[in-house]
Amino acid sequence: QEEDLPRPSISAEPGTVIPLGSHVTFVCRGPVGVQTFRLERESRSTYNDTEDVSQASPSESEARFRIDSVSEGNAGPYRCIYYKPPKWSEQSDYLELLVKETSGGPDSPDTEPGSSAGPTQRPSDNSHNEHAPASQGLKAEHLY
């Protein structure tokens, strides 16, 4: 009996609302033994892979995907999957990245911290009601 692959989780640092031109890092987490993490943008057709996997805890591994300068084109839903030989996992829940114009005002927070989509809860409701399809139909395009 092969072991079940737990659903991965995804989170964003410093948050999911990012000012234009600022950086964001998506953190994908899965079990130990993951060979490849994949960050998908809206669908399985547009993605970025990494084998730079680190151990986050005795039972968990992670990979980090950084976008140095966020543009409006980076907004949209993201999710993670991973490859633990010989199988690909299911996808994580979606995490919606929002990009906002920098207002420069002293009262406007830069980010919305603490957003993540975990493996066991109901579908995360941090996605907004409407969004444009992201790079629909492109095959194996890099995210950035």
Epitope: E2, D4, L5, R7, E40, E42, S43, R44, S45, P77, R79, I81, K87, W88, S89, E90, Q91, D93, Y94, T120, Q121, R122, P123, S124, D125, S127, N129, E130, H131, P133, A134, Q136, G137
Partner: antibody, heavy 121, light 111 residues
Framework: EQSVEESGGDLVKPEGSLTLTCTAS?????????MCWVRQAPGKGLEWIGC???????IYYASWAKGRFTISKTSSTTVDLQLTSLTAADTATYFC??????????????WGPGTLVTVSS | ELDMTQTPASVSEPVGGTVTIKCQAS??????LAWYQQKPGQRPKLLIY???NLASGVSSRFKGSRSGTQFTLTITDLECDDAATYYC?????????????FGGGTEVVVK
């Protein structure tokens, strides 16, 4: 061209059993797709039975289908739906459907033509 | 157990008219909602995915929207070819709370 096709539909007696097969072509299960079974009784609506994730092997069932219906991956290109303790209410066209290659949010955009199961004495 | 309540069961509108179909999820499903069109004797056809995104090759007369756990399919400028039954479906298979439940369907008659 990518496609899925169901087979195995038949006339079966009440309390009988049947195994339906969904055969995929033009794509690889190893990439990880949700392969789902949906049924439709004559003149009625669509009813979700369950799905198997073709790579991880994780399976999800509608609560009413648990115990009586079993989904399994039987090869790199086939998924089976085993039906047991059949009654007349199980008479339906059974569809196999795969979630999307190019769209997020896991909609089923690839459907087979369906196979008819008739339960009657 | 996830329940998808779809209304109305049937609607009749003239050519050129507008039809609005609603689907209420009994719990949060984020945007994991698809709309399908099915004609008699045919397999379902995907129209909308992710609550509001148009599938390839589908007319822009079809529009999906979401407000919390309520989802809406709007068909504008009705054509005779739009006569069919429309179904919503939760397309999330992630855990024991939700699954792929369909709404009961809406028959659209074009006069």
């Amino acid at each position: 061209e990518q496609s899925v096709e169901e087979s195995g539909g038949d006339l079966v007696k009440p309390e009988g059993s049947l195994t339906l097969t969904c055969t995929a072509s033009g794509f690889s299960f190893s990439s990880g797709y949700y392969m789902c079974w949906v049924r439709q009784a004559p003149g009625k609506g669509l009813e979700w039975i369950g799905c198997i994730h073709s790579s991880s092997g994780n399976i999800y069932y509608a609560s009413w289908a648990k115990g009586r219906f079993t989904i399994s991956k039987t090869s790199s290109t086939t998924v089976d739906l085993q039906l047991t303790s059949l009654t007349a209410a199980d008479t339906a066209t059974y569809f196999c459907a795969r979630d999307s290659e190019v769209y997020g949010w896991n909609p089923n955009d690839l459907w087979g033509p369906g196979t008819l199961v008739t339960v009657s004495s | 157990e996830l329940d998808m309540t779809q209304t109305p069961a049937s609607v009749s509108e003239p050519v050129g008219g507008t039809v609005t179909i609603k689907c209420q999820a009994s719990q949060s499903i984020s945007s994991y909602l698809a709309w399908y069109q099915q004609k008699p004797g045919q397999r379902p056809k995907l129209l909308i995915y992710g609550a509001s995104n148009l599938a390839s090759g589908v007319s822009s007369r079809f529009k999906g929207s979401r407000s919390g756990t309520q989802f809406t399919l709007t068909i504008t400028d009705l054509e005779c070819d739009d006569a069919a039954t429309y179904y919503c479906q939760c397309s999330y298979y992630g855990n024991s709370y939700v699954g792929g439940a369909f709404g009961g369907g809406t028959e659209v008659v074009v006069k």
